[in-house]
Amino acid sequence: QPNNSLMLQTSKENHALASSSLCMDEKQITQNYSKVLAEVNTSWPVKMATNAVLCCPPIALRNLIIITWEIILRGQPSCTKAYKKETNETKETNCTDERITWVSRPDQNSDLQIRTVAITHDGYYRCIMVTPDGNFHRGYHLQVLVTPEVTLFQNRNRTAVCKAVAGKPAAHISWIPEGDCATKQEYWSNGTVTVKSTCHWEVHNVSTVTCHVSHLTGNKSLYIELLPVPGAKKSAK
């Protein structure tokens, strides 16, 4: 068992490899055709370590001339994956990440998949479809979400520290009951943020404090019984 005066509880959510997609089935394509074409850009939060499937505009493949996926990742040259229907050829330029691939053969499915999403997959993804009727495109601002590791411990008299380590975006920390708190954020080069909240409770009838961490990947609460003030022996409540 951990010592009450040191770290009491930690949590890191485990996720089985889930898959997320904004793609639509054929029925939806028929119903939403004009709507989807109008929605050119989509912001899309995706949990790290899941699989993601990104879709082109819902255009029948028989009408296609060229499909191009343009991928702009931070600090990297723009990568393009193109498929030309007439010659049935695919071409890649500046694409080094082997986890970003066509879902299947592009002549059968124009969707793009990211296997095991990583922080480095944060960026802008755009599908451009060239047809005799014009060019259609659909873009995704992919925001990779990272679940923070949460810890709660005491470091001195009636003072507790709650940390949400390496979350993306930054987590929000609140306390029950409210204390006299100071919050700091530490930004890491990979885009994650550590939030540290240190609180003190002067009120002596506060027995246990709860740290509540709110995050886009889910919320987590930890609690800890406060240690007695040194020298305090007996009190009536």
């Epitope: 068992q1 951990p2 010592n3 009450n4 005066s5 029950i176 009951p177 409210e178 002596h204 009838n205 506060v206 027995s207 246990t208 404090v209 709860t210 609460s221 930890l222 609690y223 800890i224 019984e225 240690l227 007695p228 003030v229 040194p230 305090a232 022996k233 007996k234 009190s235 409540k237």
Partner: antibody, heavy 114, light 107 residues
Amino acid sequence: QVQLVQSGSELKKPGASVKLSCKASGHTFTSYWMHWVKQAPGQGLEWIGNIYPGSGSINYDEKFQGRATLTVDTSTRTAYMELSSLRSEDSAVYYCLTMTGTSWGRGTLVTVSS
Amino acid sequence: DVQMTQSPSSLSVSVGDRVTMTCQASQGTPINLHWFQQKPGKAPKLLISGASNLEDGVPSRFSGSRYGTAFTLTISSLQDEDIATYFCLQFTYIPWTFGQGTKLEIK
């Protein structure tokens, strides 16, 4: 796995005192508050007080202040609750609990009768 | 002291029912709590710690949630062995205080 083993049932006369014990294992005894709770027959639960074995710091509910005495023996990892000037309304099951109320003993039945 | 108001005090139920009970702290005081199950002659058994964390070995039909300063224990589909008294314990403030209990009885 935290275990709290409580002493056996007690039959006492009004005005007497009783001392209950609670022996802990499976956790750092001196690092967690030990609490005592009363449950009278057919009644709800009442918090009596708590003691921090690492320092001997104690809190009592006002209702039990002066009649309940909480102590610990860290060498045997045992917490004690003594209740004095017993009366019939003290007849109840008394529980010790620790780990922020997540681990409970099985309780000790105290019967006060003349 | 923080008073815990638990409702209902008793409930007539049938196997398969969805059962809900609530605890609320006096004056809407923000607190944290545990939920316990108690059967006659037995010590309370912890079901849910910290308002919503299901304890190991507790069936998934039990769940706890927080709505502001109100807390709910839900049994999604009642089983015979769930007939018992349920109570909450707030552990944020001294003195710790308990709900008066919700007793489940078979119709």
